[in-house]
């Protein structure tokens, strides 16, 4: 079952997700999506990184931590009740079926 995180309407929500880069700056692609993780990738992507930088994001979603050190925790700005639900953080470690995926439940009150 998903780990649950809470936030209040109008505040920022924080959904933690971390990995350890093999070497400093040796990043792996990460996607965040609204909805549980599908078989591959993310559904309804809100943000993604590649091996170098954040290369896709939608308004109100950002990475507040140092993603170059593996902190890919998602911040959602000024949340509303519609932001409630499951979010997927998928860390796409290269190789054969190496992905790490995390489903996080956001509850807005």
């Amino acid at each position: 079952s998903e780990v649950e995180y809470r936030a209040e309407v109008g505040q920022n929500a924080y959904l933690p997700c971390f990995y350890t880069p093999a070497a400093p700056g040796n990043l792996v692609p990460v996607c965040w999506g609204k909805g549980a993780c599908p078989v591959f990738e993310c559904g309804n992507v809100v943000l993604r990184t590649d091996e170098r930088d954040v290369n896709y994001w939608t308004s109100r979603y950002w990475l507040n931590g140092d993603f170059r050190k593996g902190d890919v925790s998602l911040t959602i700005e000024n949340v509303t009740l519609a932001d409630s639900g499951i979010y997927c953080c998928r860390i796409q470690i290269p190789g054969i079926m190496n992905d790490e995926k995390f489903n996080l439940k956001l509850v807005i009150k």
Epitope: P38, V39, V45, Q92
Partner: antibody, heavy 121, light 107 residues
Framework: QVQLQESGGGLVKPGGSLKLSCAAS????????MSWVRQTPDKRLEWVAT????????YYLDSVKDRFTISRDNAKNTLYLQMSSLKSEDTAMYYC??????????????WGQGTMVTVSS | DIVMTQSPSFLSASVGDRVTITCKAS??????VAWYQQRPGKAPKPLIY???TRHTGVPSRFSGSGSGTEFTLTISSLQPEDFATYFC?????????FGGGTKLELK
């Protein structure tokens, strides 16, 4: 328009090898995940393997993971499936398919016409 | 592996009929279900993804619904070109799996 053209199928003996190719055109090949799906003689569809846009992440059906290798050459706009230690149960029509992923993962939105692989002694 | 049980396996209908095909997943798959149409001798063609979203160019007479474990594909008014085999697929967890197919035949 999007086109996917498989080749390389044929008749092979059990234990043999075969390499399938899928030539892609009409879209930016390096911006899509790609998959192989097969259809058995009884018309059942079975996912075989998927590769990420860069080739860095790879996924296999358990029954083929030690025998098949999916790969891609983005410079040549071509997807491959190297098959070895073939068994009679690998007999099928093999399709390559495109998987959009960037803003929303969607499985197999375009398919090729397929190439037939027959494993028989 | 998640088993997708499709019913019926065969369906006879007439032009203009409304038909519904059902797919049941052996485990929860959220809305990660797609539907495909396959005409004889042709490759599968995508119709629906995310349980209810039509692919570009798919006629509005095709609709999908459901979430969790039960899903349906409805064709509101059958056209001659709709007589084909239909497959559902789940893409919630690995391996991606397909239903056994529903062959829609002209009555």
């Amino acid at each position: 328009q999007v086109q996917l053209q498989e080749s390389g199928g044929g008749l092979v003996k059990p234990g043999g090898s075969l390499k399938l190719s899928c030539a892609a055109s009409g879209f930016t090949f390096s911006s899509y995940y790609m998959s192989w799906v097969r259809q058995t003689p009884d018309k059942r569809l079975e996912w075989v393997a998927t590769i990420s846009n860069s080739g860095g992440s790879i996924y296999y059906l358990d029954s083929v993971k030690d025998r098949f290798t999916i790969s891609r050459d983005n410079a040549k706009n071509t997807l491959y499936l190297q098959m070895s230690s073939l068994k009679s149960e690998d007999t099928a029509m093999y399709y390559c398919a495109r998987d959009p992923y960037y803003s929303n993962y969607v499985p197999m939105d375009y398919w090729g016409q397929g190439t037939m692989v027959t494993v028989s002694s | 592996d998640i088993v997708m049980t499709q019913s019926p396996s065969f369906l006879s209908a007439s032009v203009g009929d409304r038909v519904t095909i059902t797919c049941k997943a052996s485990q929860y798959v959220d809305t990660y279900v797609a539907w495909y149409q396959q005409r004889p001798g042709k490759a599968p063609k995508p119709l629906i993804y995310s349980a209810s979203t039509r692919h570009t160019g798919v006629p509005s007479r095709f609709s999908g619904s459901g979430s969790g474990t039960e899903f349906t594909l409805t064709i509101s008014s059958l056209q001659p070109e709709d007589f084909a085999t239909y497959f559902c697929a789940q893409y919630s967890s690995s391996p991606l799996t397909f239903g056994g197919g529903t062959k829609l035949e002209l009555k």
